[in-house]
């Protein structure tokens, strides 16, 4: 999906009002220095691409993020504020239902959510140079 035509300010508002707090709740008890940010993004569409990938694509050691509250709210925000996003996700959602797993908070998941926090911060940060 190409995130270029999303309403970035509306997505930012959704992040600030709820998603950020859900991420903090998920990470509660974890030190901010525990994980190094290894995933980065260069502009808002790129950040959303990386955020979508880390939030919804199962990875080795962390298959359960898509059912977390922050993930559901991220999905809702993208569906509302990114034209055509919902349509591209129908097949992906059906595939997810088939391989639904029990929610387990592993260290790998905590690391992944730490990366997500960094990506969201970059999505929101003011530009220093005009793109």
């Amino acid at each position: 999906y190409d995130f270029t035509n999303c309403d970035f300010e509306k997505i930012k508002a959704a992040y600030l009002s709820t998603i950020s707090k859900d991420l903090i709740t998920y990470m509660s008890g974890t030190k901010s220095t525990e994980f190094n940010n290894t995933v980065s993004c260069s502009n808002r569409p790129h950040c959303l691409t990386e955020i979508q990938s880390l939030t919804f694509n199962p990875t080795a050691g962390c298959a359960s993020l898509a059912k977390e509250m922050f993930a559901m709210k991220t999905k809702a925000a993208l569906a509302i504020w990114c034209p055509g996003y919902s349509e591209t996700q129908i097949n992906a959602t059906q595939a997810m239902k088939k391989r639904r797993k029990r929610k387990v908070t592993t260290n790998k998941c905590l690391e992944q959510v730490s990366q997500l926090q960094g990506l969201w911060r970059r999505f929101n940060r003011p530009l220093l140079k005009q793109q």
Partner: antibody, heavy 120, light 105 residues
Framework: EVQLQQSGPVLVKPGASVKMSCKAS????????MNWVKQSHGKSLEWIGV????????KFNQRFKDKATLTVDESSSTAYMELNSLTSEDSAVYYC?????????????WGQGTLVTVSA | QIVLTQSPSIMSASLGEEITLTCSAS?????MHWYQQKSGTSPKLLIY???NLASGVPSRFSGSGSGTFYSLTISSVEAEDAADYYC????????FGGGTKLEIK
């Protein structure tokens, strides 16, 4: 715990330059912008500029474009601000400030400030 | 540049009183942040992005507003609230308001 430790007070003569430091700890230095803010005695806060320690990109308040130079030393997690051609108008407390964890437009962490006094 | 005008510049309040400090922007901004600065110390973030309470800030502080008008409310003033309060926005580049000095009667 996030900490910003600034260098001590300085007394400098008009026309001279001064370079102050802001040593960051408790987080990954290159992950957050570093802002610099001026506060003259009894006055409000004035944003000077910001630097991205990751790539040294900077943005300035136009008023300080020719007055301030912002740099970083990634190896020591330290940000620097140099002020040139000092006059009495530059006498102030200068703060470094880091953005919030959620979004960097709000300044959640501040150094203790460096007092610069310009006097003959 | 967006100019932020705070009013009043000085306010005197009694303990337990509810007070509201205002910040007016010269043109519309998306968000406002608020800081408290006590004498001889660095500013402290109180409210970020208009209405979010910063970590460790008492719940008697709240923020609201949109467009060109924003406000900070203290529901029940305490002695320790005596300080200068600044609003702050970052649109094209950051600016701060002139501040409101809160004195306790």
């Amino acid at each position: 715990e996030v900490q910003l430790q600034q260098s001590g007070p300085v007394l400098v003569k008009p026309g001279a330059s001064v370079k102050m430091s802001c040593k960051a700890s408790g987080y990954t230095f290159t992950d957050y912008y570093m802002n610099w803010v001026k506060q003259s005695h009894g006055k409000s806060l004035e944003w000077i500029g910001v630097i991205n320690p990751y790539n040294a990109d900077t943005k300035f308040n136009q008023r300080f474009k020719d007055k301030a130079t912002l740099t970083v030393d990634e190896s020591s997690s330290t940000a620097y601000m140099e002020l040139n051609s000092l006059t009495s108008e530059d006498s102030a407390v200068y703060y470094c400030a880091r953005g919030d964890d959620y979004a960097e437009e709000s300044f959640a962490y501040w150094g203790q400030g460096t007092l610069v006094t310009v006097s003959a | 540049q967006i100019v932020l005008t705070q009013s009043p510049s000085i306010m005197s309040a009694s303990l337990g009183e509810e007070i509201t400090l205002t910040c007016s922007a010269s043109s519309s901004v998306s968000y406002m942040h608020w800081y408290q600065q006590k004498s001889g110390t660095s500013p402290k973030l109180l409210i970020y992005f208009t209405s979010n309470l910063a970590s460790g800030v008492p719940s008697r502080f709240s923020g609201s507003g949109s467009g060109t008008f924003y406000s900070l409310t203290i529901s029940s003033v305490e002695a320790e609230d005596a300080a200068d309060y600044y609003c702050h926005q970052w649109s094209s580049y950051p600016t701060f308001g002139g501040g409101t000095k809160l004195e306790i009667k």
